[in-house]
C-alpha cells in the first residue's frame, strides 16, 4: 500500500480467483485513543473499533472511503483504491489502446516546435467518476523539471454504439533550449482513477521524436502564363522554432481531387514555393516536416485549384 | 558562444553540401544497423544515449544561432579553446566565434572518425561478418573534415590487445550511430544557418 495523495491510498493486488488479497492497517488521524469506531462509505455498519482498523482487501467491495468517528463526530478519512495486477501485468482498463504508432500506446504526445512545450492526449469510453493527474520530468534518475497543467476533456466522439472521450494536457519543460541535443528522454506519468480503480500510464520520448509542425500558412496561387501550371507559395507556420534557417522545414505539395484514388501531382521541396499542375475540382495541399530529423508531417493546408 | 549574422555568402560555403551528405550517410548507416542487428537493442528506445564528445567539445553552444543567445537555457555552455584557420570560413572577416563553432565541429568529426575506425577494425574480425561500417559514411566524414580544413593533432587509432566482445561492439556501434546522427543534425542546421546568413 502507498499514499497517492493526502488520505488517499493505493492497494496493489494480485488479481486472480481466490487470491488472498492484502492485509491493510488503517490508523485514525487523531490524538484520541478511546471510543473510536470505523465505517465504510455511506454505510452506518460499524466495522471495528479502536485507533487502528485491520482489514483484508481482496476486491472492490473492500475498497472505498473508511471513516473513523467518535461520538458522532468524524475524525478522519482514508480512501482506499485498488490497483489490479493480472498475470504480472498492471491493468489498463480505463484508457483505450490507440495502437499508434504501436500496440499498447495509451498516451500520445506531440510538440509543434523545439521550445520544450508538448501536448499529450488519451482516450476513454468512461464518462463519469473519472479523474486524472499528470506528472512529467526530463530523465528519471536525476529528474529535471517539467510543468504540466490539469488534464481537460478536449473532445467527444461517437464510435459506433460507444461514445469516446479524449483528454489532453499541456506540459512545458522548465528550462529548455531549442537547439539542445537531448540525451535523456521526457517521462510522462498519468494517474487515472475511475471510481475505486487506480491505474497508471507512462510514456517516454524525446521532443525531437514527437515533433509535428503546424500546417504551412498563407497558401497562395499564381497561374503561370500560357501554361496549366500554377505557382503555389506559402510561409512557415507561426508556431515553428526560429530562426528558420537553423530550424528548417521541408515541404510536400500535392494536387488531388476529392477522392484519394484520383490521380495527383506531387512534388517535394525545401523552398516555400513550387510549380504544379492544377486540375478542375482539385485542391492544392502543402504539408511540412523538419528538414533534418524526419519526425511527423504536419496536417495539410489546402486551397482549391479554381 | 554564438554565430554572428555576418557570415560567408552561399557560393563560398562548401561545407553545406558535405554536411547534407554526412546526415544522409549516417542516417542510412543507422537504418542498416537497425535492420541487420534486429535482435540487438539498437532502437532509440532501447539504447543508452551517450555523447562521446561530452566535456570535450561544445558544438551546440559554440554554434548557437544569434537569435537563441537570449535564451538563458541555451547559455550554460562549457568554454573550450580551438585552433581557428578553417577553409569553410570563406572570408577573413569571419569572427572568432564562428571559427570556434566550425573547429568544434571538426573536433567532433575527428573523435567519431577514430571511434568508427577502431570499431570497424573489430567488426572485421567477427566470424559472423554481420555488419561493417559503410565506407561511404567514413569517406563523407573525411570530406567534411577536409572542407573544414583545421590543423589539429592526430588522434591515434585505439588498438586493443584483448579479444573483442562482438556483442558489446555491435551495441556500442548502435549507441555511436544514434549519437552521431543527432550531432549530424546539429551540424546540418548550423551549416544551413551559416549559408543563409
Amino acid at each position: 500500500i502507498w499514499e497517492l495523495k493526502k488520505d488517499v491510498y493505493v492497494v496493489e493486488l494480485d488479481w486472480y480467483p481466490d487470491a488472498p488479497g492484502e492485509m491493510v492497517v488503517l490508523t485514525c488521524d487523531t490524538p484520541e485513543e478511546d471510543g473510536i469506531t470505523w465505517t465504510l462509505d455511506q454505510s452506518s455498519e460499524v466495522l471495528g473499533s479502536g485507533k487502528t482498523l485491520t482489514i483484508q482487501v481482496k476486491e472492490f467491495g473492500d475498497a472505498g472511503q473508511y471513516t473513523c468517528h467518535k461520538g458522532g463526530e468524524v475524525l478522519s478519512h482514508s480512501l482506499l483504491l485498488l490497483h489490479k495486477k493480472e498475470d504480472g501485468i498492471w491493468s489498463t482498463d480505463i484508457l483505450k489502446d490507440q495502437k499508434e504508432p504501436k500496440n499498447k500506446t495509451f498516451l500520445r504526445c506531440e510538440a509543434k516546435n523545439y521550445s520544450g512545450r508538448f501536448t499529450c492526449w488519451w482516450l476513454t469510453t468512461i464518462s463519469t467518476d473519472l479523474t486524472f493527474s499528470v506528472k512529467s520530468s526530463r530523465g528519471s534518475s536525476d529528474p529535471q523539471g517539467v510543468t504540466c497543467g490539469a488534464a481537460t476533456l478536449s473532445a467527444e466522439r461517437v464510435r459506433g454504439d460507444n461514445k469516446e472521450y479524449e483528454y489532453s494536457v499541456e506540459c512545458q519543460e522548465d528550462s529548455a533550449c531549442p537547439a539542445a541535443e537531448e540525451s535523456l528522454p521526457i517521462e510522462v506519468m498519468v494517474d487515472a482513477v475511475h471510481k475505486l480503480k487506480y491505474e497508471n500510464y507512462t510514456s517516454s520520448f524525446f521532443i525531437r521524436d514527437i515533433i509535428k509542425p503546424d500546417p504551412p500558412k498563407n497558401l497562395q496561387l499564381k497561374p503561370l502564363k500560357n501554361s496549366r501550371q500554377v505557382e503555389v507559395s506559402w510561409e512557415y507556420p507561426d508556431t515553428w522554432s526560429t530562426p528558420h534557417s537553423y530550424f528548417s522545414l521541408t515541404f510536400c505539395v500535392q494536387v488531388q481531387g476529392k477522392s484519394k484514388r484520383e490521380k495527383k501531382d506531387r512534388v517535394f521541396t525545401d523552398k516555400t514555393s513550387a510549380t504544379v499542375i492544377c486540375r478542375k475540382n482539385a485542391s492544392i495541399s502543402v504539408r511540412a516536416q523538419d528538414r533534418y530529423y524526419s519526425s511527423s508531417w504536419s496536417e495539410w493546408a489546402s486551397v482549391p485549384c479554381s | 558562444r554564438n554565430l554572428p549574422v555576418a557570415t560567408p555568402d552561399p557560393g563560398m560555403f562548401p561545407c553545406l553540401h558535405h554536411s547534407q551528405n554526412l546526415l544522409r550517410a549516417v542516417s542510412n548507416m543507422l537504418q542498416k544497423a537497425r535492420q541487420t542487428l534486429e535482435f540487438y537493442p539498437c532502437t532509440s528506445e532501447e539504447i543508452d544515449h551517450e555523447d562521446i564528445t561530452k566535456d570535450k567539445t561544445s558544438t551546440v553552444e559554440a554554434c548557437l544561432p544569434l537569435e537563441l543567445t537570449k535564451n538563458e537555457s541555451c547559455l550554460n555552455s562549457r568554454e573550450t579553446s580551438f585552433i581557428t584557420n578553417g577553409s569553410c570560413l570563406a572570408s577573413r572577416k569571419t569572427s572568432f566565434m564562428m571559427a570556434l563553432c566550425l573547429s568544434s565541429i571538426y573536433e567532433d568529426l575527428k573523435m567519431y572518425q577514430v571511434e568508427f575506425k577502431t570499431m570497424n577494425a573489430k567488426l572485421l574480425m567477427d566470424p559472423k561478418r554481420q555488419i561493417f561500417l559503410d565506407q561511404n559514411m567514413l569517406a563523407v566524414i573525411d570530406e567534411l573534415m577536409q572542407a573544414l580544413n583545421f590543423n589539429s593533432e592526430t588522434v591515434p587509432q585505439k588498438s586493443s590487445l584483448e579479444e573483442p566482445d562482438f556483442y558489446k561492439t555491435k551495441i556500442k556501434l548502435c549507441i555511436l550511430l544514434h549519437a552521431f546522427r543527432i550531432r549530424a543534425v546539429t551540424i546540418d542546421r548550423v551549416m544551413s544557418y551559416l549559408n543563409a546568413s
Epitope: 496549366r228 501550371q229 521541408t250 484514388r261 484520383e262 490521380k263 495527383k264 501531382d265 506531387r266 512534388v267 517535394f268 521541396t269 525545401d270 510549380t275 499542375i277 486540375r279 478542375k280 | -
Partner: antibody, heavy 118, light 107 residues
Framework: QVQLVQSGAEVKKPGSSVKVSCKAS????????LHWSRQAPGQGLEWMGW????????EYAPKFQGRVTITADESTSTAYMELSSLRSEDTAVYYC???????????WGQGTLVTVSS | DIVMTQSPLSLPVTPGEPASISCRAS??????LHWYQQKPGQAARLLIA???QSISGVPSRFSGSGSGTDFTLTISSLQPEDFATYYC?????????FGQGTKVEIK
Amino acid sequence: QVQLVQSGAEVKKPGSSVKVSCKASGGTFSDYYLHWSRQAPGQGLEWMGWIDPENGDTEYAPKFQGRVTITADESTSTAYMELSSLRSEDTAVYYCARNKELRYFDVWGQGTLVTVSS
Amino acid sequence: DIVMTQSPLSLPVTPGEPASISCRASQSISINLHWYQQKPGQAARLLIAFASQSISGVPSRFSGSGSGTDFTLTISSLQPEDFATYYCQQSNSFPLTFGQGTKVEIK
C-alpha cells in the same frame, strides 16, 4: 494486370509524320496520366509530354512543342502520339507510360521503333 | 532543364555482390527522384519512387537514398535477373529528365 500495348514498328521518310498508338488494359483509362518518352540509339531516355485522358489536357517538353501532338480516345482506352516534320534524329524507340501520379511512371509500354530514313 | 548524370555508365558485378549506382542532378531536386530498370526488348519497371520509397512487388534488395543533388540506387546482392540498365529520373520540374543509364553487367 495493368498493361500498355503499343503499335508496331514504323519506317518513315524525313519530313513526314508518324502516329504511334498505346492501348491500355486493366484499370480505368481516364484514372491515369499518360506520358510519351523516347530513346534514340545509344542515347538516354527523353521525355516528350503527357495527356490527362479525362479532359484532354496536355503538356509538352519545350524541345517537341509544335511538332508533337498527344491525344487520347477514352472509348478505346488508347492514347496516340503524333510527331511531325520527322528528321533522321527522330529515329528512336518511343515509349508510352502511365501512372496516377503525374511526374513518374509505374507502368510502361514495350516500346515502338520508329526509323526515319530516306 | 535539369541535367541528370549517372555514374558509372557501365558496372561489371559478380552475382551475389552488392552494386551501387550514382545519380547527380545539376540543381537541387529535394527527393523528386525515381529509379527504373530496363531489360532489352522489355517494358521498363519502376523500382524506387521519391529517392527511397520502395515499390510493392520490387524485391527488398533494391534500395534508394539521397536528397538534394546526390542519389544512390543500391542492390544489396545482385541476382542473375538484375543484370539490366538502370535509369534515374527527376520530377522536380518540367520537362522531366532522365539519366543516361547505367548498364549492370556480369563480371
